[in-house]
Amino acid sequence: MAVTACQGLGFVVSLIGIAGIIAATCMDQWSTQDLYNNPVTAVFNYQGLWRSCVRESSGFTECRGYFTLLGLPAMLQAVRALMIVGIVLGAIGLLVSIFALKCIRIGSMEDSAKANMTLTSGIMFIVSGLCAIAGVSVFANMLVTNFWMSTANMYTGMGGMVQTVQTRYTFGAALFVGWVAGGLTLIGGVMMCIACRGLAPEETNYKAVSYHASGHSVAYKPGGFKASTGFGSNTKNKKIYDGGARTEDEVQSYPSKHDYV
């Protein structure tokens, strides 16, 4: 029951997270005009990954797409790529996890297959969440760098009394949506991996050995001790996990792919 709940919750949390990652990627407010120096501007600028917008006091909003690939900063391209990879992995993860759900019966699918699928989707959600967090963090870092650079030369003198104010940008709503969504996807992925441990069938190479004691026979089975120490009295139905060496190996080999995060 706890395994089903953990798996179900992991799926729902990941679903919300991936929906958030998609929303953040599509949002226009990745960076918004900093109003500290001019809180009463009649023109408000904000930018997304795909277009930049201007909202005027008149209520008119004008957005322009970035109709170039080569002319865009490499960092922006990297952020786009990270977000898209995150969405794709997340979507595949969702698809896999639907079939892996314990509450859904598909033909005569083995529990071991469901466990593998749960683990696969969990890892996909973890990578998806990390991609989103990395993408948003790279963009945030880019904003911070640009913010302080533009602060250093806030006013560019144009002779005499004339001033031209450089527009500074600060964190937009999409960044916070992205961070939260990435975190949720990551948590969902971890929950799926935890659920996988509970789904994995008992894998043992040992046969039950009978020892004959005087008067009555007691059967000792591997795992029987665990069953008798509060891990569940029904040893026949209980799947006891052996510590998960396989999963641990996968988890250990994973971070090396993403050392840059």
């Epitope: 009649a42 023109v43 600028n45 930049s52 909202r55 006091s57 008149s58 209520g59 322009r64 031209t164």
Partner: antibody, heavy 120, light 113 residues
């Protein structure tokens, strides 16, 4: 046809109050940002206040902040300017103006104005 | 606040003549987000409210004759009337539409010789 008709002006003593109204017709009133602009006896144009269509944000000229209040009644299609603690420098012809939606914040329609005289 | 300075304060011209008036702002009215200038030109005839002629520094408002044209960017702007007509006699104001307070210039009075 777009029409803006101001009313409520008159002669008032310094420190007194007055409420100006601007009845709008011929357009979807709640889709536009509205402003009050005054013209001094020296013919200088001075923006007074604006109420935006998005969020109903209000902006005021520093010299009228805390004394004037801009508001709208969408049901009546009317823009108001509540003026209190009036000073002699507030004497002017007060225009109600509509900010055009695609005119880069420029005011595309103006009323005929209502005169406010602050004098003892 | 952005200060708008108009020059000359008055112009005396003959009908058919080309006329140019200038407007200078203390701060750039060019928005980096869309590369548009937030400056408007108004015409005010005696006893009438101001009428919008040009917005965005160079876009003519609908119904405005094509003899009126606006140009300039950043801090320096120009209103040109290619062939002045008698009905063009008025006071012309420029306005900052970029930042509150939405300041106006003192105006340029166009008179007939």
């Amino acid at each position: 046809e777009v029409m803006l008709v101001e009313s409520g002006g008159g002669l008032v003593k310094p420190g007194g109050s007055l409420k100006l109204s601007c009845a709008a017709s011929g357009f979807t009133f709640n889709s536009y940002t509205m402003s009050w602009v005054r013209q001094t006896p020296e013919k200088r144009l001075e923006w007074v206040a604006t109420i935006t269509v998005i969020g109903g944000n209000t902006y005021y000229l520093d010299s009228v902040k805390g004394r004037f209040t801009i508001s709208i009644d969408n049901g009546k299609n009317t823009l108001y300017l509540q003026m209190s603690s009036l000073r002699s420098e507030d004497t002017a012809l007060y225009y109600c103006a509509r900010m055009g939606q695609t005119q880069r914040n420029a005011m595309d329609y103006w009323g005929q104005g209502t005169s406010v005289t602050v004098s003892s | 606040d952005i200060v708008m300075t108009q020059s000359p304060s008055s112009l005396s011209v003959s009908a058919g003549q080309k006329v140019t008036m200038r407007c200078k702002s203390s701060q750039s009215l060019l928005n980096s987000g869309n590369q548009k200038n937030y400056l408007a030109w108004y015409q005010q005839k005696l006893g009438q409210p101001p009428k919008l002629l040009i917005y965005g520094a160079s876009t003519r408002e609908s119904g405005v004759p094509d003899r009126f044209s606006g140009s300039g960017s950043g801090t320096d702007f120009t209103l040109t009337i290619t062939s002045v007509q008698a009905e063009d006699l008025a006071v012309y104001y420029c306005q900052n539409d970029y930042s509150f307070p939405l300041t106006f210039g003192a105006g340029t009075k166009l008179e007939l010789k």
